[in-house]
Amino acid sequence: VEIYTSGALEAVNGTDARLKCTFSSFAPVGDALTVTWNFRPLDGGPEQFVFYYHIDPFQPMSGRFKDRVSWDGNPERYDASILLWKLQFDDNGTYTCQVKNPPDVDGLVGTIRLSVVHTVRFSE
């Protein structure tokens, strides 16, 4: 399995963001597919569970992302993206997308560095 992400994402405090993660695999996508999203805060604290998909999507039942994340992927299109709602400044950090699609071997996790800002900075 190979994972593809945007690498970096900037979003405004209070808005929603789509964390895009796509993948490729030699094995057909079926019921064995799993997707796990985790988050590591900027202060380097312990990694936190964000989201899990296996046949159905599952939100975390506790923690900072409870009631603030939803599935926005489409496995048949090799898309494992999620939506993060109501962004806060302490959502700054690194998000990892891990896709397993047996019998294909596991690849490296995809990472997205999210920066939550006051206003979007437009580059020339």
Epitope: D56, M61, S62, K100
Partner: antibody, heavy 116, light 106 residues
Framework: QVQLQQPGAELVKPGASVKLSCKAS?????NYWMHWVKLRPGQGFEW???????????DYNEKFKRKATLTVDKSSSTAYMQLSSLTSEDSAVYYC?????????WGQGTTLTVSS | QIVLTQSPALMSASPGERVTLTCSAS?????MYWYQQKPGSSPKPWIY???NLASGVPARFSGSGSGTSYSLTISSMEAEDAATYYC?????????FGAGTKLELK
């Protein structure tokens, strides 16, 4: 590294109340929700409830709603669980634990003995 | 609430033996956690969201399952694996734990 410090033991009389403490260090206290779990020998683990240290919001297992009250003191990075109207059924080991990718970090547990 | 039933309650395995511990849920759950506990110690996270090994867990461990049936497998038993293993679900509130499987070295 992450540490959750709990007193080793508490001895209290039936009908009394007790406030168990859990002092956190090695991480940003408000970044992770604190959970409390009960372990009675031969009866397995029971989840009591959780508290969001940022705003004090709580969620309890229905079974413990009238038994346990969870609070935090952000200034000292300490979580508390008060247990009221104690009976022998409350004698157990009580753990505090933080939720990260799972209940990943646990205190050593406080052994509560309710006895006259 | 969801009841988790672990089997067997007690199991003995020889070094090098393949070991499978099972956890059955009273209704369908989305994923499973597993914890290892040794006497006198706090539980340690062992497997999270069904199949992901916690930090420091040897690669001989694996987790699998879906719906109401989950398992933890040790491909080759080692002495240090002797412990009690608990499953825990948290795709439905309240989170619940199995009663544990005590794994002994034969």
């Amino acid at each position: 590294q992450v540490q959750l410090q709990q007193p080793g033991a508490e001895l209290v009389k039936p009908g009394a109340s007790v406030k168990l403490s859990c002092k956190a260090s090695g991480y940003t206290f408000t970044n992770y929700w604190m959970h409390w779990v009960k372990l009675r020998p031969g009866q397995g683990f029971e989840w009591i409830g959780e508290i969001n240290p940022t705003n004090g919001g709580t969620d309890y297992n229905e079974k413990f709603k009238r038994k346990a009250t969870l609070t935090v003191d952000k200034s000292s990075s300490t979580a508390y669980m008060q247990l009221s109207s104690l009976t022998s059924e409350d004698s157990a080991v009580y753990y505090c634990t933080i939720y990260t990718t799972a209940l990943d970090y646990w205190g050593q547990g406080t052994t509560l003995t309710v006895s006259s | 609430q969801i009841v988790l039933t672990q089997s067997p309650a007690l199991m003995s395995a020889s070094p090098g033996e393949r070991v499978t511990l099972t956890c059955s849920a009273s209704s369908s759950v989305g994923y499973m956690y597993w914890y290892q506990q040794k006497p006198g110690s706090s539980p340690k996270p062992w497997i999270y969201v069904t199949s992901n090994l916690a930090s420091g867990v040897p690669a001989r461990f694996s987790g699998s399952g879906s719906g109401t049936s989950y398992s933890l497998t040790i491909s080759s038993m080692e002495a240090e694996d002797a412990a009690t293993y608990y499953c825990q679900q948290w795709s439905s509130n309240p989170p619940t734990f199995g009663a544990g499987t005590k794994l002994e070295l034969k």
